[in-house]
């Protein structure tokens, strides 16, 4: 049974290949029940979460996970060298930095090792799962009485990745939003004086080494300018 | 079969300009990324200036504002063109397709040209 399998997880054009046993319709067995799904990410090219839900397992199970690269130097079968565990039960693996590949085929294997053959593979393509760690050392420039310039680092190459700026003063209901290149630096040509603005940024490895969907956390916030909240109509909501 | 073709490589003086080409077939320029590598003797293959399907461009701080990567889809040609050479630019040039990162054993290139030689004399 082949099914393509349509994930929110920036896989969208993978295939899934499941093998599930077909049983007579008069007994049914576990090797029927589907395998959970493995959501896979790899954090800032340093090691890879690959994690399923355990828990929609009928009863407590330890399933184990393979993995190898199709049609690559690397297709050899490897077993998970490293488990993550929920209450006890394996509900993910941890691959390092030397096991990740990510412009080569990435083939996931989920087994359940008392019935053999229920068993389901996935095909993911690595370079649209990868998470940058969130942008660090946000600084602030004026560059003239109503201009400033905002500054940030991330710890990977710059050219892999793009950015998204918000900011907001105190009495914002919402926050505004600018998309940046890889130059990470981001200028906001009008500035109230009279007003506090915060700004945060966050990014993704996007459009030049890979096509990831999924945004890094947001950096730890960055204010400027007066205080304004005695007068600020909005703050209490802002901060509920 | 040739799938990545680069051209306009040569010896120019300092301040002078050159204009690479990069043919490929249609397949490959649809695909993620086109750009452009340079490697000078005895040094590490570096990117110079990529462009993306959608058009998002990247320059190396050493080139940016001199150099400009450009895309002509009826043709399936990128284009570096190089203004205000210096000798320091003198380097072997290749075209490449795919994702533009080469990294610690990382590599998302499908598909690389045979190189083109510029020398920039002061």
């Known amino acids: 049974l082949n099914t393509t399998i349509l994930t929110p997880n920036g896989n969208e054009d993978t295939t899934a290949d499941f093998f599930l046993t077909t049983m007579p319709t008069d007994s049914l067995s576990v090797s029927t029940l589907p395998l959970p799904e493995v959501q896979c990410f790899v954090f800032n090219v340093e090691y890879m979460n690959c994690t399923w839900n355990s828990s929609s397992e009928p009863q407590p199970t330890n399933l184990t996970l393979h993995y190898w690269y199709k049609n690559s130097d690397n297709d050899k079968v490897q077993k998970c060298s490293h488990y993550l565990f929920s209450e006890e039960i394996t509900s993910g693996c941890q691959l390092q930095k030397k096991e990740i590949h990510l412009y080569q085929t990435f083939v996931v294997q989920l087994q359940d090792p008392r019935e053999p053959r229920r068993q389901a593979t996935q095909m993911l393509k690595l370079q649209n799962l990868v998470i940058p760690w969130a942008p660090e050392n946000l600084t602030l420039h004026k560059l003239s009485e109503s201009q400033l310039e905002l500054n940030w680092n991330n710890r990977f190459l710059n050219h892999c990745l793009e950015h998204l700026v918000q900011y907001r003063t105190d009495w914002d209901h919402s926050w505004t939003e600018q998309s940046v290149d890889y130059r990470h630096k981001f200028s906001l040509p009008s500035v109230d004086g009279q007003k506090r603005y915060t700004f945060r940024v966050r990014s993704r490895f996007n459009p030049l080494c890979g096509s990831a969907q999924h945004w890094s956390e947001w950096s730890h916030p960055i204010h400027w300018g007066s205080n304004t909240s005695k007068e600020n109509p909005f703050l209490f909501a802002l901060e509920a | 079969q040739v799938q990545l073709q680069e051209s306009g490589g040569g010896l120019v003086q300092a301040g002078g300009s050159l204009r690479l080409s990069c043919a490929a077939s249609?397949?490959?320029?649809?695909?993620?990324?086109m750009g452009w590598y340079r490697q000078a003797p005895g040094k590490e293959r570096e990117l110079v200036a990529g462009i993306a399907t959608g058009g998002t461009t990247y320059y190396a701080d050493s080139v940016k504002g001199r150099f400009t990567i450009s895309r002509d889809n009826a043709k399936n040609t990128v284009y570096l063109q190089m203004n205000s050479l210096k000798p320091e630019d003198t380097a072997v040039y290749y075209c490449?397709?795919?994702?533009?990162?080469?990294?610690?054993?990382?590599?998302?290139?499908?598909?690389w040209g045979q190189g083109t030689q510029v020398t920039v004399s002061s």
């Open positions: 490449a397709a795919g994702y533009l990162l080469l990294w610690e054993g990382q590599d998302g290139h499908d598909y």
């Open positions: 249609g397949s490959i320029f649809a695909g993620p990324a």
